[in-house]
Interface confidence: medium
């Protein structure tokens, strides 16, 4: 749940569940900042525009990030 507070992190809980890159609309990697001291990874799914908080430490999510960056490097000229 997005919560408005002095520490403005977005995620109360995080998910370890694998995400199919094909079902991704957008993947936001929000680096640590003065507002939130840890990295947050927020996946927007194609289905219903659902947003998920992903666990940056999870093996499945690390693999997802690799797959997405590989896909991006293929597309870029």
């Amino acid at each position: 749940i997005p919560l408005s507070r002095t520490v403005r992190c977005t995620c109360i809980s995080i998910s370890n569940q694998p995400v199919n890159p094909r079902s991704l609309e957008k993947l936001e990697i929000i680096p640590p900042s003065q507002f939130c001291p840890h990295v947050e990874i927020i996946a927007t799914m194609k289905k219903k525009g659902e947003k998920r908080c992903l666990n940056p430490e999870s093996k499945a999510i690390k693999n997802l990030l690799k797959a997405v960056s590989k896909e991006r490097s293929k597309r870029s000229p």
Epitope: I1, L3, C36
Partner: antibody, heavy 124, light 109 residues
Framework: QVQLVESGGGVVQPGRSLRLSCAAS????????MHWVRQAPGKGLEWVAV????????GYADSVKGRFTISRDNSKNTLYLQMNSLRAEDTAVYYC?????????????????WGQGTTVTVSS | EIVLTQSPGTLSLSPGERATLSCRAS???????LAWYQQKPGQAPRLLIY???SRATGIPDRFSGSGSGTDFTLTISRLEPEDFAVYYC??????????FGPGTKVDIK
């Protein structure tokens, strides 16, 4: 199996302090937001406090703000509630509860796992 | 701060009957942020419904939730002996506040 076990309750005089603990097992504690909820004798449920998975996000009910502090130690799979300046009206059964296991950030999945509670009695 | 009101305070029904419990909010609540719980004497609460209408894991389909805005309903289609308990609605509001309603007791007529 997924379990939450509270401890630390007891009888305490008004103005004194007490620290409650909640030991979690059977799930990856460090991924979940956690709550404290209390229930005074013969009364309804009252939400007390919430803490995010990393301990950075915190929120409190107005009735305990400035007196109670929620914290967690992910290395020990334990949630805490430090209660200072206790009052007679803080007498209740205190439950810890896990934030529901959904992953859509624009959705509230409820509190899907609860402990059995620990009793705090504030009396002189 | 949003206040939740539940009615009736007590509902006296017989096994097999339909129970309709109401939860009213003082301001509009997103249905994504509304949950229902069941509590039996001497036990911890149990999550029944989240997101106003989604059943939690292991909850029988005789329990259903509906509603939007300020009016929400929990329906038990056919009361079983184990359903006699107190039911609470709860909402999440920013700040964050997780308010419970005062509860509705469903007892045996």
């Amino acid at each position: 199996q997924v379990q939450l076990v509270e401890s630390g309750g007891g009888v305490v005089q008004p103005g004194r302090s007490l620290r409650l603990s909640c030991a979690a097992s059977g799930f990856t504690f460090s991924e979940y937001g956690m709550h404290w909820v209390r229930q005074a004798p013969g009364k309804g449920l009252e939400w007390v406090a919430v803490i995010g998975f990393a301990g950075l996000i915190k929120g409190y009910a107005d009735s305990v703000k400035g007196r109670f502090t929620i914290s967690r130690d992910n290395s020990k799979n334990t949630l805490y509630l430090q209660m200072n300046s206790l009052r007679a009206e803080d007498t209740a059964v205190y439950y810890c509860a896990r934030e529901g296991a959904g992953s859509n950030i624009y959705y509230y999945y409820g509190m899907d796992v609860w402990g059995q509670g620990t009793t705090v009695t504030v009396s002189s | 701060e949003i206040v939740l009101t539940q009615s009736p305070g007590t509902l006296s029904l017989s096994p097999g009957e339909r129970a309709t419990l109401s939860c009213r909010a003082s301001q509009s609540v997103s249905s994504s942020y509304l949950a229902w719980y069941q509590q039996k004497p001497g036990q911890a609460p149990r999550l029944l419904i989240y997101g106003a209408s989604s059943r939690a894991t292991g909850i029988p389909d005789r329990f259903s939730g509906s509603g939007s805005g300020t009016d929400f309903t929990l329906t038990i289609s056919r009361l079983e002996p184990e359903d006699f308990a107190v039911y609470y609605c709860q909402q999440y509001g920013s700040s964050p506040i997780f308010t419970f309603g005062p509860g509705t007791k469903v007892d045996i007529k």
